[in-house]
């Protein structure tokens, strides 16, 4: 028996369902009574789901997994993982045993888009050219960790005096806070871009300082 899985990682959004594809080629005359299918976590070998002795033994992994029972006889051994969590990320092994055995691993990459950044300024009044200001760009509930870029109004990257912190919440999602310390010119626009490296999703925020008042 030869087991095949997708080479590329499966990307799944948090709280959505994911399908980990796995297939084998049944011999003529194949029956489900001969099939032993085991899904497990590749690194720890923890059992996730199994089909043995001619029947679905069910989920051994937080009751969020399912096979495609009607498709098994055709060689479709894919696993459905419901309500994906950050902690589901990793490699899953599909192990198929009939007359002989084979296995292959598929990677699950979990992702969550970042919110549109909110911008805050400190101090936020009585600003004069030459003043040192702190601009904070905050974006929430994303995964994995973000990449943060700052630019001025001319699109020139601002790399000095930037401090970025990322904190995971109880669900494993990250809140990003990036602080830019800059000396004000006569007027100017400062924009931050929060990029999700897996989703290739960019979230933009900007603040424009034109004497008074401020625009965000």
């Amino acid at each position: 028996v030869e087991v095949q899985v997708s080479e590329d990682p499966v990307v799944a959004l948090v709280d959505t369902d994911a399908t980990l594809r796995c297939s084998f080629s049944p011999e003529p005359g194949f029956s489900l009574a001969q099939l032993n299918l085991i899904w497990q976590l590749t690194d720890t070998k923890q059992l996730v789901h199994s089909f043995t002795e001619g029947r679905d033994q069910g989920s051994a992994y937080s009751n969020r997994t399912a096979l495609f029972p009607d498709l098994l006889v055709q060689g479709n051994a894919s696993l459905r993982l419901q309500r994906v969590r950050v902690t589901d990320e990793g490699s899953y092994t599909c192990f198929v045993s009939i007359q002989d055995f084979d296995s292959a691993a598929v990677s699950l990459q979990v992702a969550a888009p970042y919110s549109k950044p909110s911008m805050t300024l400190e101090p936020n009044k009585d600003l004069r050219p030459g003043n040192m200001v702190t601009i904070t760009c905050s974006s929430y509930q994303g995964y994995p960790e973000a990449e943060v870029f700052w630019k001025d109004g001319q699109g020139v990257p601002l790399t000095g005096n930037v401090t970025t912190s990322q904190m995971a919440n109880e669900r494993g999602l990250f809140d990003v806070h990036s602080v830019l310390r800059v000396v004000l010119g006569a007027n100017g626009t400062y924009s931050c871009l929060v990029r999700n490296p897996v989703l290739q999703q960019d979230a933009h925020g900007s603040v424009t300082i034109t004497g008074q008042p401020l625009t965000f």
Epitope: K45, S97, D100, F101, S103
Partner: antibody, heavy 119, light 109 residues
Framework: EVQLVQSGAEVKKPGSSVKVSCKAS????????ISWVRQAPGQGLEWMGG????????NYAQKFQGRVTITADESTSTAYMELSSLRSEDTAVYYC????????????WGQGTLVTVSA | EIVLTQSPATLSLSPGERATLSCRAS??????LAWYQQKPGQAPRLLIY???NRATGIPARFSGSGSGTDFTLTISSLEPEDFAVYYC???????????FGQGTKLEIK
Amino acid sequence: EVQLVQSGAEVKKPGSSVKVSCKASGGTFSSYAISWVRQAPGQGLEWMGGIIPIFGTANYAQKFQGRVTITADESTSTAYMELSSLRSEDTAVYYCARGERGSYLIDYWGQGTLVTVSA
Amino acid sequence: EIVLTQSPATLSLSPGERATLSCRASQSVSSYLAWYQQKPGQAPRLLIYDASNRATGIPARFSGSGSGTDFTLTISSLEPEDFAVYYCQQRSNWPPMYTFGQGTKLEIK
């Protein structure tokens, strides 16, 4: 070329444990079904248990359940068989064996390890 | 647990004769049955797998047959090097577990 090289002969006291190793070369260690089979002097073959490293869970013959532990270290391509609470009847040659990749057949054997249990 | 019973325990024949060795299972083993040959001081050698398939390099004089609970190993014309102990072995479907028969000693008459 497939090779299974086992650790050397052991003399053990009753009640103690023995751990025999089996280093494999020639092929992807993780994808083989490895069995441990023993043969007491002048007696037949006895399958003790086996493991598929990539699968991870070992299976044991009923007779040895609770007394034998089979493990596999994928990083060194080595399988281990540990037998505890040894008695004189455990004196035997212990073989590790395996088949081709993905096969349950046992067609390659180690050279055997003689374990003697004697007071 | 499946028990395999081999008969006869000892078989005395002359070179050139036909040897028929029997293996009976206490319950059906599908076709997951193998035959091994073992000579003194050596590890066993796989002869037949899945009841009737010859392993690589095994001469055509060795053949296997049977299904379910009754299996036979036949050596059509004995060569001097064929005198040895023969074991049948079964494998359960899942989990993969094996049982050997007690062996048949094939000796020169």
